[in-house]
Interface confidence: medium
């Protein structure tokens, strides 16, 4: 008799793929545009990235550090009108992109939460949650929660409001903290909260350290759904050298949980390469004309247009990974097992029942390495075969689809491999 199929877990929409943050509408659109109507015109691009949700804003009225002049129910006229927002929502829904609204109150000011007026701000947030839920948004984000007094309690209440409206609505909280204990204390009283933090930004770019951070986090959080990013708002290039961007994209898309990216992560957007651009929100490089300040500063391979035409680009890798992440059961909700592969390497398996399985091997080092995959670390349910097919490499030059002998696996410096193999009874 064939073995019984394992029951599929309940899947929420944010379990099915990546979220894409646009914190600064004007920087994202460039050319002095930067409004909701313009963003609507970029939804096809987001569809091409196969992201499942857009984390937008904040876009509400906020006069710096003035609680009385902060209105979470009103869109700042610089960004457009409520009608523009409704129209964006409708268009996004047609393209199956969910919209999450950032309600961090004092986003233009010193303290995001007006720390001396907690009660006033809390009431404003509650009213805003109810208002925007009725308007049709799919969820909310609040950032800098380390500056919010009694964050756990407020988040629990806001979660109750959000989930009370519909189980299909999401609350994301962001913190600058990278401390696991602080992160866990925020999570412990908020069951379905998605938390973005700086936890992985301390990975020190070594395989061993990254492996220990990831496994510690997963062990500490148990069965709860995680999100993976390097910070609550900033670009990957703020934390990583260019040679590790592909490796981290592969890792973020294949860890169990929701990958969360900021606009520009898909092309390796780097503020440091654009003189005068703010680190936290540089202008998005759609093409070579996007940054006219310094002629010649932007080459085609730095832009969306240039990378779209290059199958070996970071953007092409992002699109392929995003596509795999959204359709393979083992990557959608599969079990995760990390195991030893040798110094400088981080390797793990993702598997679900009798579906195709995936092996990820990441070389964080700047030397080529032979991987000594220690299959003895793995449970019987996740054993390794002798060979696996190469789905993709983060480096050019390998023949995709070819079977690789796992005992003889060699990785180039900074190379990541995604291999697939079938379930064997």
């Amino acid at each position: 008799r064939a073995p019984r199929c394992r029951e599929l877990p309940a899947q929420k929409w944010w379990h099915t793929g990546a979220l894409y943050r646009i914190g600064d509408l004007q920087a994202f659109q460039g050319h002095g545009a930067g409004n909701l109507a313009g963003l609507k015109g970029r939804l096809d691009y987001l569809s091409s990235l196969k992201v499942k949700g857009l984390v937008l804003g904040p876009i509400h009225k906020n006069q710096k550090d003035d609680v009385a002049q902060t209105d979470l129910l009103q869109i700042d006229p610089n960004f457009g009108s409520k009608e523009d927002f409704d129209s964006l929502l409708q268009s996004a829904k047609k393209k199956s992109i969910r919209v999450i609204l950032d309600l961090t109150p004092n986003y233009r000011g010193e303290n995001s939460w007006f720390s001396t007026q907690v009660d006033t701000v809390a009431t404003k947030v509650k009213d805003a949650l109810e208002f925007w839920l009725q308007a049709g948004v799919d969820g909310f984000q609040v950032r800098d929660i380390e500056n919010l007094k009694d964050a756990s309690s407020f988040l629990a209440e806001w979660q109750n409001i959000t989930k009370g409206f519909s189980e299909d609505r999401l609350l994301i909280a962001g913190t600058n903290s990278s401390d696991l204990q602080q992160i866990l204390s925020l999570l412990e009283s908020n069951k379905d909260l998605l938390l973005t933090s700086s936890y992985l930004s301390d990975s020190g770019s070594t395989g061993e350290h990254t492996k220990s951070l990831v496994t510690q986090y997963l062990n500490a959080t148990g069965n709860r759904w995680c999100s993976w990013s390097l910070s609550q708002a900033r670009l990957l290039t703020s934390f990583l050298p260019a040679q590790l961007l592909r490796l981290y994209q592969l890792m973020l898309f294949t860890l169990p949980g929701t990958p969360v990216f900021s606009y520009g992560d898909e092309i390796g957007l780097d503020a440091a390469a654009l003189p005068g651009q703010p680190m936290e929100a540089p202008v998005m490089l759609w093409d070579e004309s996007s940054f006219p300040d310094i002629p010649g500063a932007v080459s085609a391979n730095m832009t969306v247009k240039g990378q779209s035409e290059d199958p070996g680009s970071l953007l092409s890798l992002f699109r392929r990974l995003s596509d795999q992440r959204s359709k393979e059961r083992s990557l959608l909700h599969g079990d995760f097992h990390a195991f030893s592969a040798g110094p400088g390497l981080f390797s793990y398996i993702r598997h679900w029942d009798q579906n195709e399985r995936f092996l990820v091997v990441l070389n964080f080092g700047d030397v080529g390495l032979s991987a000594g995959l220690q299959a003895s670390d793995l449970p019987a349910s996740a054993s390794l075969p002798a060979k696996a097919d190469l789905l993709l490499s983060t480096q050019p030059g390998r023949e995709e689809g070819s079977p690789l002998e796992l005992e003889r696996l060699k990785l180039e410096p900074h190379e990541g491999l995604l291999l697939r193999f079938p379930y064997a009874a």
Partner: antibody, heavy 114, light 107 residues
Framework: QVQLKESGPGLVAPSQSLSITCTVS????????VHWVRQPPGKGLEWLGV???????NYNSALMSRLSISKDNSKSQVFLKMNSLQTDDTAMYYC????????TSYAMDFWSQG | DIQMTQSPASLSASVGETVTITCRAS??????LTWYQQKQGKSPQLLVY???TLADGVPSRFSGSGSGTQYSLKINSLQPEDFGSYYC?????????FGGGTKLEIK
Amino acid sequence: QVQLKESGPGLVAPSQSLSITCTVSGFSLTTYGVHWVRQPPGKGLEWLGVMWTNGITNYNSALMSRLSISKDNSKSQVFLKMNSLQTDDTAMYYCARGGHYGSTSYAMDFWSQG
Amino acid sequence: DIQMTQSPASLSASVGETVTITCRASGNIHNYLTWYQQKQGKSPQLLVYTAKTLADGVPSRFSGSGSGTQYSLKINSLQPEDFGSYYCQHFWNTPYTFGGGTKLEIK
């Protein structure tokens, strides 16, 4: 006037559970939170947990697995339940009135006798 | 979790003297600090909240100050009824931990 009164057993056998009820008067549990604090003989104060106005609870992480706080607004009662007691749980147990968690004047302004 | 370190653990002083008790938090608690007084065999009583606001009925010889991670309670011109134990407690994020206490005794 504001009062908080506890009722519960004075003695609990090791490994058994402790249940204490705090009955309040002079204010409503829908307006003020109630904290639980304990003090072992000759030692300092230890915060155990809080029941907020909207029913959300927070606990001391060190005791979280053994502790549960609930309330009945209509009876103006807050309940503390603690499992698997050991001798080092011997203490004076207090309930105290707090704010609602959006208020800025945070403090425990009225305490029970313990 | 934020830890509160109170000093000194004990203190002897005479009536009429001025004393200061300090409390250090392991992280920024943004002035959400409370002071309590406890007499032998009695429940604690609120003295000061949000670092420097005196609770109703507390004499003006008590004053609280500080910010960030460092806070203090000052008692001018000690009176006989001021002797007992003093505790600080933060109210930034749960758990709302107390300091270890300061026992103020008559010299």
